[in-house]
């Protein structure tokens, strides 16, 4: 059974992940057309099911494409000082949270998502898990 300290650690990690994802989303939401129009042509794959920490495997698999988008669409109004570091930090948190005991084959939904929908989906996931922990 998880101890209160491990639960607290998980909660902190989720909150950190949540803040990182929200920071990216806020930056993108500040983009003006036609830049936003261009960014929305990037497609992301969504999990069929995301209710447990192990489902973070699906986020991990899409981090490379996310990094690519953020690098390509760097902006003077929203400049992530080091996209590589940010994605690397997210990756470290995701790996710790999902654990490595079980290697899950991610099942993706048939529909793809824009970067905005993708980030919102994983933000909702973090919020949902945090609420069950608190």
């Amino acid at each position: 059974a998880p101890t209160s300290s491990s639960t607290k650690k998980t909660q902190l990690q989720l909150e950190h992940l949540l803040l990182d994802l929200q920071m990216i989303l806020n930056g993108i939401n500040n983009y003006k057309n036609p830049k936003l129009t261009r960014m929305l042509t990037f497609k992301f794959y969504m999990p069929k099911k995301a209710t447990e920490l192990r489902h973070l495997q699906c986020l991990e698999e899409e981090l490379k494409p996310l990094e690519e988008v953020l690098n390509l669409a760097q902006s003077k109004s929203f400049h992530l000082r080091d996209t590589k570091d940010l994605i690397s930090n997210i990756n470290v948190i995701v790996l710790e949270l999902k654990g490595s005991e079980t290697t899950l084959m991610c099942e993706y939904a048939d529909e793809t998502a824009t970067i905005v929908e993708f980030l919102n989906r994983w933000i909702t996931f973090c919020q949902s898990i945090i609420s069950t922990l608190t």
Epitope: K32, T41, F42, P65, L72, S75, T112
Partner: antibody, heavy 121, light 113 residues
Framework: EVQLVQSGAEVKKPGESLKISCKGS????????IGWVRQMPGKGLEWMGT????????RYSPSFQGQVTFSADKSISTAYLQWSSLKASDTAMYYC??????????????WGQGTTVTVSS | DIVMTQTPLSLPVTPGEPASISCRSS????????????LDWYLQKPGQPPQLLIY???YRASGVPDRFSGSGSGTDFTLKISRVEAEDVGVYYC?????????FGGGTKVEIK
């Protein structure tokens, strides 16, 4: 090796239907937009539009909207260009080309060999 | 639609000599916010499909010799070949991808004198 292989040359009569194909290999076919480009005899290149095989999202250039249909079968890594009723003016070479994860942010870095379509009565 | 205009229509060249092709767009291809210029150059050799030479104004595509270079700003662009080789003959096209629909220039035919 990353490549796009197109179906063979076609000779058709006006009013007939046609579907040509473009099969990708050596990369994650579903993750890249596939553009279609027309080249009429002795003329330049025209971008017809693009399809994302991962979800079959299509974007048509206004000049080609309603004239052609793009489709894709991701299970066999193949994109298609089709006409329901060919006209003599459809006579051209048609190329498919890989357009990256976004057709705005990437050039067309891999091209099919082209499919010649001849429409004549 | 953005109109892309190339000059000259035809360019006779001497092997070993430099050559340059111009391309002009009817509106700016520069996104000043992100600093990208959404212009590519393609070469179509006789009897072959086009191939990507230069993307995003000045980046050489994989396997493209360094004698090819792209430059320009806003609406005026140039493709330069520092020393033309016999294998460089064909039709060169510029293409914009800042705005839908993507559009090509009419092409410049490069041939050996």
């Amino acid at each position: 090796e990353v490549q796009l292989v197109q179906s063979g040359a076609e000779v058709k009569k006006p009013g007939e239907s046609l579907k040509i194909s473009c099969k990708g290999s050596g990369y994650g076919f579903t993750n890249y937009w596939i553009g279609w480009v027309r080249q009429m005899p002795g003329k330049g290149l025209e971008w017809m539009g693009t399809i994302y095989p991962g979800d079959s999202d299509t974007r048509y250039s206004p000049s080609f909207q309603g004239q052609v249909t793009f489709s894709a079968d991701k299970s066999i890594s193949t994109a298609y260009l089709q006409w329901s009723s060919l006209k003599a003016s459809d006579t051209a070479m048609y190329y498919c080309a890989r357009q990256g994860r976004s057709y705005y942010y990437f050039g067309m870095d891999v091209w099919g060999q082209g499919t010649t379509v001849t429409v004549s009565s | 639609d953005i109109v892309m205009t190339q000059t000259p229509l035809s360019l006779p060249v001497t092997p070993g000599e430099p050559a340059s092709i111009s391309c002009r767009s009817s509106q700016s291809l520069l996104d000043s916010d992100e600093g990208n210029t959404f212009l590519d150059w393609y070469l179509q050799k006789p009897g072959q499909p086009p191939q990507l030479l230069i993307y995003t104004l000045s980046y050489r595509a994989s396997g493209v010799p360094d004698r090819f270079s792209g430059s320009g700003s806003g609406t005026d662009f140039t493709l330069k070949i520092s020393r033309v080789e016999a294998e460089d003959v064909g039709v060169y096209y510029c293409m914009q991808r800042i705005e839908f629909p993507l559009t090509f220039g009419g092409g410049t035919k490069v041939e050996i004198k």
